[in-house]
Amino acid sequence: EPTMYGEILSPNYPQAYPSEVEKSWDIEVPEGYGIHLYFTHLDIELSENCAYDSVQIISGDTEEGRLCGQRSSNNPHSPIVEEFQVPYNKLQVIFKSDFSNEERFTGFAAYYVATDINECTDFVDVPCSHFCNNFIGGYFCSCPPEYFLHDDMKNCGVNCSGDVFTALIGEIASPNYPKPYPENSRCEYQIRLEKGFQVVVTLRREDFDVEAADSAGNCLDSLVFVAGDRQFGPYCGHGFPGPLNIETKSNALDIIFQTDLTGQKKGWKLRYHGDPMPCPKEDTPNSVWEPAKAKYVFRDVVQITCLDGFEVVEGRVGATSFYSTCQSNGKWSNSKLKCQPVDCGIPESIENGKVEDPESTLFGSVIRYTCEEPYYYMENGGGGEYHCAGNGSWVNEVLGPELPKCVPVCGVPREPFEEKQRIIGGSDADIKNFPWQVFFDNPWAGGALINEYWVLTAAHVVEGNREPTMYVGSTSVQTSRLAKSKMLTPEHVFIHPGWKLLEVPEGRTNFDNDIALVRLKDPVKMGPTVSPICLPGTSSDYNLMDGDLGLISGWGRTEKRDRAVRLKAARLPVAPLRKCKEVKVEKPTADAEAYVFTPNMICAGGEKGMDSCKGDSGGAFAVQDPNDKTKFYAAGLVSWGPQCGTYGLYTRVKNYVDWIMKTMQENSTPRED
């Protein structure tokens, strides 16, 4: 507890002090006082630098004195032999004796009293920035007019802080400008603009005069601008040393003007204004900005449109453009969005064709569709080459996004028919010679495949069985072989409307319009043993002349057997209709005159006994295409005949092409269209 006075005596005083002793006293007087310590008696063994025995006086870390020997007062009116005056309120006294004393020493007697100190004059560092006022036990600071005492109660400054500027334009100057600014002041000014505007400060060099920097380059008085985490300055000197236009990139700016006690100059004056926050003109590849400007600022909106072949993908959805807004923080919205090359994705598969994997599926990539040759060809042209277009579709120059259509090649047998050894009016044949040949098992008959979904046959073949079982692709129609061949399932039978349906078909004498179409449930896959025959064209090139040769094939009656197991074929010439009329009907069911002959019939045969017969009905009479010798077309269908091995009558297919096309068109699926 601090005291105002006290007494300190060496051990055993006034008797001799003992050897080997160390004792200390901590003196403390109240705050605001100094200590006056004085000795009235001093009798301590004398040694050089008081090395043996001593009394030591310490103030903080400083040794104020070290005493030994004998002292007497110089003043007859005062008992004081030694004294110390310290301007601090704490003091330590330490007494030490060594192991031996040659004489008897009585030690010391000392007293301390608290004394007033003049804080205003007693210290090197002046405690007050302006006026210092001493009183007993303390002091106080005071300020000149228009200054105020800071919270530290020592420093005076002018009241220049706390101003907040919110207007978009303004002027700020140091206190008293252009008169000298106050010393020892810290002036803080705040500029706070609405978000989206940056503070731009402009100064003129001549409007700035602040005490210059010291020799180390440190500003004694300084002006500093702080915008968020960016600092401009400190600035000082005669004439503004910084940029005359400071773009802070922030809507908040703190201006701090700090002055010391000396060297007042006229100060500074600045102007500020709020600029809409600029957003950088970013380099966004593969795109254009609309509107195009040299500078974009807060609230500006641009439409960024991707160049052709590029798109912006957001949430797995592609778009060709997006909007971006210059935000209050100087950054663009949607800045993560980028124009990237359009991806057309995996190309679609096509029936009876293929597409090679492209190196890439991105914009500009090229793919090529091909058909399964030689059985299919590309019907709708375009060459099969597609490129990845800007809209994300695979596009062909001719067809656009429409895919190529692979349709069966017609009328081309894999192996041409060659008449080998004669077998009673015909030759053995292979299905590869007549890949269009269809076998009907009930009734035993034939038909001709004309495309993936349609079989052409004679009306009399299907009039009694509207759900015929058909087979393709096999030379032999042995049951074991048929099991391995392709069975065709009918969906619907279309008999020509001109075909007269009879109660008793066996007595038929009128075979006019003996033609029918069978629509298949599933498409037929073409190959070396299954391939359609062409239909005749409608031009006069397809009008048959007498003597024109055609091929017939089937598993019908031969001279030896009622039914053939292996496919037979023959080449026969077209004959005048009268030749057929002249042949006597074998086993007639009516008068010879009752048999009807019409222009819808072709007469053929009569050579070397080659003819079609029972069981061949519905098969094609195949003639070489006059415009393409590599192809055969179905000129006729085996219909009827007066007598096997003579002349036969064939339905003239050319007369029914319109009906065939119309029927197929009206009963197709979207896949065929």
Epitope: E348, S349, E351, G353
Partner: antibody, heavy 118, light 109 residues
């Protein structure tokens, strides 16, 4: 006749791996893009992955990307799905399907069941 | 991704009645790339209608499909016993993922 037959499913612990196969027949396998689609018990269909006809381009569902890999061997007419780091939520019947016009899935296998459980 | 929402989740009708199944997309879908599948319990799905309105092979003509943009419909003019199944709509979009609706279960009332 087009046929797709999946195999390789079974019971596996979380974190484990499986390789599903899909054997194709009745069509020219190398001409068609193929997909895997799964169906969790009592739930709807979820597309998993697609591969182009030649096998150079693949797309996978985000939640399986990096864990599942679709591939094919056209010489063997077989489609594969390599499934690593399996999770309980991958439990499902996995179907392979052929992609036809406009990426419709015109033929599907009968499915193979994958159960992920500890 | 494009989300397909089918409604209703379950549709209870009697044979002979007309059924209308709806599929709504979260964003526009090309008509060419919207397909429908039929699935019966324990069986694999079957392509039923492709490109919005084209019937797959073997699908009876009582089925029809229509729609454009975000709204698509599968209609059965007169329900037959074999039509009771779950129907899924499905869309393809080049940026993926391919998505399916959650399904509509068509059950006998």
């Amino acid at each position: 006749e087009v046929m797709l037959v999946e195999s390789g499913g079974g019971l596996v612990k979380p974190g484990g791996s499986l390789r599903l196969s899909c054997a194709a027949s009745g069509f020219t396998f190398s001409n068609y893009a193929m997909s895997w689609v799964r169906q969790a018990p009592g739930k709807g269909l979820e597309w998993v992955a697609t591969i182009s006809s030649g096998g150079s381009h693949t797309y996978e569902l985000d939640s399986v990307d990096g864990r599942f890999t679709i591939s094919r061997d056209n010489s063997k007419d077989t489609l594969y799905l390599q499934m690593n780091s399996l999770r309980a939520e991958d439990t499902a019947l996995y179907y392979c399907a052929r992609l036809f016009t406009k990426h419709a899935m015109d033929y599907w296998g009968q499915g193979t069941l994958v159960t992920v459980s500890s | 991704q494009i989300v397909l929402t089918q409604s209703p989740a379950t549709l209870s009708l009697s044979p002979g009645e007309r059924a209308t199944l709806s599929c709504t997309a979260s964003s526009e879908v090309s008509e060419s790339y919207l397909h429908w599948y039929q699935q019966k319990p324990g069986k694999a799905p079957k392509l039923w209608i492709y490109s919005t309105s084209n019937l797959a092979s073997g699908v009876p003509s009582r089925f029809s499909g229509s729609g454009s943009g975000t709204d698509y419909t599968l209609t059965i003019s007169s329900l037959q016993p074999e039509d009771f199944a779950t129907y899924y709509c499905h869309q393809y979009y080049r940026l993926h993922p391919i998505t399916f609706g959650q399904g509509t279960k068509l059950e006998i009332k």
